[in-house]
């Protein structure tokens, strides 16, 4: 007999999600309004295009990138969309409350939508580590906690460490990775006998995951430059990100072949490593002065990513119960750290060159920021993991992990797959 959506979740999910949506609508009604000031339409369209790029990255890029499981591809794509839609709404409100609220109502601009989309992207990166082991009701909790934690982290970093939008948002890679890994650590790990095939990848879903990787690859320059302050910084960020991801693709494919005894190319390595350069240059993409430096970083990031994809999944699978094809968690944790370290190295080089106390002070601040991001990610991730383990959410049984049929109606399937 085909698996049915558990009765209790059927009662719990619509009630939980629709009540939450109603609450969000009320919050928007009482506390928000649109920015009504005069602006020319050309400028609005240009500003919207950046937001559109980010939405494509989130919905198609990350949606499809996580869809490589043989029996969990539908859920991966649709649950991603659900989380994105919910996350953007909550992120707009939260950012408004944290930054504008004392002055009255929250003003919604295209920039605030852009910011909210990037905050929601954090959840889509994290969820890769737990997708297939949780239901939608649990994902709603994860969205709310993670967006709230990231919003507060950004506000704290902005106020204490005096950083701008770009710098405090670029902690997203490290934050999302460690948040996802700590949530995964809390969830039931072992796959019961007979279900191991479900977390294997299949050709068509793997192709759609590659499609997701391509969308991310194309739009990563938009992501890295979206929050920068001036055209000159944005242009530099776009160029450097493009060079870095271009080199990381070449490195990923060559490195993947090199890592295999028969010289074969691994799909999982490529999905992962094509993005490596973009993540690694994220924090300092606007600061890198010449293409060759961005390319070197792309090369290093590609090698680290392939190396990580070869040696880390075994460890992640044993300790955290993360399937081999869920590469984003460990990939972003390594590459996000690399990106942060590159930025700190730039500041250290400044200190050595200038002997300026101001710059030495900034090195300490940057190390403090990174440490805080990791600590808050781990703590909020563990809290989320503990919340998701509560019986109230009726989590799928381990035997039903990585199974679309638990959640979806397939009229043409009378019995299992």
């Amino acid at each position: 007999m085909s698996s049915k959506y558990p009765r209790s979740v059927r009662r719990c999910l619509p009630l939980w999600a629709l009540t939450l949506e109603a609450a969000l609508i009320l919050l928007f009604y009482f506390f928000t309004h649109y920015d009504a000031s005069l602006e020319d339409q050309k400028g609005l369209v240009a500003s919207y295009q950046v937001g559109q790029d980010l939405t494509v990255m989130a919905a198609i890029g990350l949606g499809f990138l996580t869809s490589s499981f043989r029996r969990h591809s539908w859920s991966s794509v649709a649950f991603n969309l659900f989380m994105l839609a919910l996350g953007v709404q909550w992120a707009i409100l939260l950012d408004g409350f944290l930054s504008q609220f004392p002055s009255g109502k929250v003003v919604i601009t295209l920039f605030s939508i852009r910011l909210a989309t990037m905050s929601a992207l954090s959840v889509l990166i994290s969820v890769d580590a737990v997708l297939g082991k949780v239901n939608l009701a649990q994902l709603v909790v994860m969205v709310l906690v993670e967006v709230t934690a990231l919003g507060n982290l950004r506000m704290v970093i902005s106020n204490i460490f005096n950083t701008d939008y770009h710098m405090n948002m670029m902690h997203i890679y490290v934050f999302a990775a460690y948040f996802g890994l700590s949530v995964a650590w809390c969830l039931p790990k072992p796959l019961p006998e007979g279900t191991e095939d479900k977390d294997q990848t299949a050709t068509i879903p793997s192709l759609s995951a590659m499609l997701g990787a391509l969308f991310l690859w194309m739009f990563w320059p938009s992501f890295n430059s979206a929050l920068l302050r001036s055209p000159i910084e944005r242009k530099n960020a776009v160029f450097n990100t493009y060079y870095a991801v271009a080199v990381s693709v070449v490195t990923a494919i060559s490195g993947s072949s090199l890592a295999h005894p028969q010289g074969k190319i691994s799909k999982t390595y490529v999905h992962s490593a094509v993005l490596a350069g973009g993540v690694a240059v994220g924090t300092s993409c606007h600061l890198i002065p010449s293409p060759w430096l961005a390319m070197v970083l792309g090369l290093v990031a590609g090698l680290i990513s392939v190396g990580g994809a070869k040696y880390l999944p075994g460890c992640c699978n044993r300790v955290l119960g993360i399937p081999h094809s869920s590469i984003m968690g460990y990939n972003f944790s390594l590459l996000g750290l690399l990106g942060e370290i590159i930025y700190i190295v730039l500041l250290v080089l400044d200190t050595v060159g200038a002997g300026n106390g101001m710059i030495g002070f900034q090195v300490l601040l940057s190390i403090g920021e990174l440490s805080l991001a990791i600590v808050i990610a781990l703590m909020s991730g563990l809290l989320t993991g503990l919340l998701l383990n509560l019986k109230i959410w009726k989590a799928p049984h381990e035997a039903k992990y990585f199974d679309d049929q638990v959640f979806w109606k397939f009229p043409h399937l009378a019995v299992g797959f």
Partner: antibody, heavy 129, light 108 residues
Framework: EVQLVETGGGVVQPGRSLRLSCAAS????????MHWVRQAPGKGLEWVAV????????YYADSVKGRFTISRDNSKNTLYLQMNSLRAEDTAVYYC??????????????????????WGKGTTVTVSS | SSELTQDPAVSVTLGQTVRITCQGD??????ASWYQQKPGQAPILVIY???IRPSGIPDRFSGSTSGNTASLTITGAQAEDGGDYYC???????????FGDGTRVTVV
């Protein structure tokens, strides 16, 4: 020649509104952030507001937040400052200024600098009953 | 919002060197810009960044930063250097700009 010309100043009663304009010429207006800065009689400069080059973000000094609105029309090369609920302490010469983002580079990184490199001559706003 | 503190007034003999200071927490994070304003005129940018002069500004103007203090030095002051000098910095996190109270420089 790079030029900024402010208009719209005048005498207004407390609580009333006024709209200042700043016409830009001689440069690509849509590529620059823009500021309003004011100077009360016999006092120093006070930053009022900034708007990003594409109009996507606006920031205000605490003293004018909720009362003043900065906006721009890139198709008309014009910057605006809508001033509502005016008070006596808003009496000042209002300057619009172009934000220049310049950089210098070492072999390994760029350094960005933000400042106001071009200023208008100013327009006088007097709030008095 | 962060504040920048300047000495109200300094006097300098023609041809001598004068140093104007500006103090504030925001200067730990970003460099100061310096503006010169003469009576009835709009301000003019004279120094920004580590020690960068816009074109048209004489090389007798120089800037430096140490900790939370920025300095503007006029080496060999000329009569036309008299006026009000304002330091300015940008708070990176809030994108708010702040001006110092200004220092009146008199060349005698």
């Amino acid at each position: 020649e790079v030029q900024l010309v402010e208009t719209g100043g005048g005498v207004v009663q407390p609580g009333r509104s006024l709209r200042l304009s700043c016409a830009a010429s001689g440069f690509t207006f849509s590529s620059y952030g823009m500021h309003w800065v004011r100077q009360a009689p016999g006092k120093g400069l006070e930053w009022v507001a900034v708007i990003w080059y594409d109009g996507s973000n606006k920031y205000y000094a605490d003293s004018v937040k909720g009362r003043f609105t900065i906006s721009r029309d890139n198709s008309k090369n014009t910057l605006y400052l809508q001033m509502n609920s005016l008070r006596a302490e808003d009496t000042a010469v209002y300057y619009c200024a172009r934000e220049m983002v310049s950089y210098s580079s070492s072999w390994y990184r760029r350094y960005y600098y933000y400042n106001m490199d071009v200023w208008g001559k100013g327009t006088t706003v007097t709030v008095s009953s | 919002s962060s504040e920048l503190t300047q000495d109200p007034a300094v006097s300098v003999t023609l041809g001598q060197t004068v140093r104007i200071t500006c103090q504030g927490d925001s200067l730990r994070h970003s460099y100061a810009s310096w503006y010169q304003q003469k009576p009835g005129q709009a301000p003019i940018l004279v120094i920004y960044g580590k020690n960068i002069r816009p074109s048209g500004i004489p090389d007798r103007f120089s800037g430096s930063t140490s900790g939370n203090t920025a300095s503007l030095t006029i080496t060999g002051a000329q009569a036309e250097d008299g006026g009000d000098y304002y330091c300015n910095s940008r708070d990176t996190s809030t994108d708010h700009y702040v001006f110092g109270d200004g220092t009146r420089v008199t060349v005698v």
